[in-house]
């Protein structure tokens, strides 16, 4: 089938002791090959800093995956989910204020 | 092969402003960040900031907030910084980085010499 | 602010001889955000290692480094005419970003 870019959604969800948890999801997503990090100002995080979920199929003849992180209250501004789908790419900030959703359909 | 290459060396007068750019190649310019370091004759690095060209979210130096600009054209790869109202102590040589898969400095330009003086 | 500080300012070494550079952290980094340059008059820097201990590509295997906490070791094993240099060590864990003052690899 023909190349089908992933939409990219990231939230936080706060956990104890001053610190957030980011979740960077992408679905719908053709073919299954996909890069997706978690990058602190640019730079990728550590693989043992990060947990990943499996590529699985979504129903539709894509995929999805997901990819989080811990990091410090007040520090969002400095992470960005990092995404690579077939020649694509993109950056993905977490979301500040009050907003705790970001989408982004990648062309 | 990754490049930074950076405008000429400038002359400027206390109190002028001067932009200086850096034009990226050998790589997808916004799939990296940008970031500016100076060095004064004989001393140190001190980072300056940082753009994400992808999404043009910049970070600044506090030090460095209210005098400075970083900028990005997607369309050239090229990033931009603009100091303003300039003093002696401005007088460095700046450079442009770009941030690697594990480290924040991975290639950098050659360096563009700005002297402050009246 | 995480201030690092090198020592000694100035390192005086023959080639051949074991050169050992030393940074201290002001507070606790993670390994993950301790990386070295390397830098010769003139010319910009360039990294050489990341994370404490990891080789940037073309980096010399002489070239080592250590350390976790607060105190952070770059090691050159056996000096070449090549290494004489200034080296900085530099943290990305909190911002400001900040750089060591470096430490000046001379020939003695």
């Known amino acids: 089938g023909s190349t089908v870019p992933p939409m990219v959604n990231v939230t936080c969800s706060e956990v104890s002791e001053g610190n957030i948890t980011v979740t960077c999801r992408a679905s719908s997503f053709y073919p299954r090959n996909i890069t997706l990090t978690w990058r602190q100002d640019g730079v990728s995080l550590s693989h043992n800093t990060q947990q990943w979920g499996d590529v699985l199929p979504d129903g539709n003849g894509t995929y999805q995956t997901w990819v989080a992180t811990r990091i410090r209250q007040g520090e969002e501004q400095r992470f960005t989910c990092y995404m690579e789908h077939s020649g694509n790419h993109g950056t993905h900030p977490v979301p500040s204020g009050n907003s705790h959703h970001h989408h982004h359909h990648h062309h | 092969e990754v490049q930074l290459v950076q405008s000429g060396a400038e002359v400027k007068k206390p109190g002028a402003s001067v932009k200086v750019s850096c034009k990226a190649s050998?790589?997808?310019?916004?799939?990296?960040?940008i970031y500016w370091v100076r060095q004064a004759p004989g001393q140190g690095l001190e980072w300056i900031g940082y753009i994400d060209p992808y999404i043009g979210r910049i970070i600044y130096n506090q030090q460095f907030k209210d005098r400075v600009t970083i900028t990005a054209d997607t369309s050239t790869s090229t990033a931009y910084l603009e100091l303003s109202s300039l003093r002696s102590e401005d007088t460095a040589v700046y450079y442009c980085?770009?941030?690697?898969?594990?480290?924040?400095?991975?290639?950098w330009g050659q360096g563009t010499l700005v002297t402050v003086s009246s | 602010e995480i201030v690092l500080t090198q020592s000694p300012a100035t390192l005086s070494l023959s080639p051949g001889e074991r050169a050992t550079l030393s940074c201290s952290a002001s507070?606790?980094?993670?390994?993950?955000?301790l990386h070295w340059y390397q830098q010769k008059p003139g010319q910009a820097p360039r990294l050489l290692i990341y994370?404490?201990?990891n080789l940037a590509s073309g980096i010399p295997a002489r070239f080592s480094g250590s350390g976790s906490g607060t105190d952070f070791t770059l090691t050159i094993s056996s000096l070449e005419p090549e290494d004489f240099a200034v080296y900085y060590c530099q943290q990305g864990g909190s911002l400001p970003l900040t750089f060591g003052q470096g430490t000046k690899v001379e020939i003695k």
């Open positions: 994370r404490t201990s």
């Open positions: 050998g790589y997808a310019f916004t799939s990296n960040n």
């Open positions: 980085s770009r941030s690697g898969e594990r480290s924040n400095f991975d290639y």
């Open positions: 507070s606790s980094i993670s390994s993950n955000y």
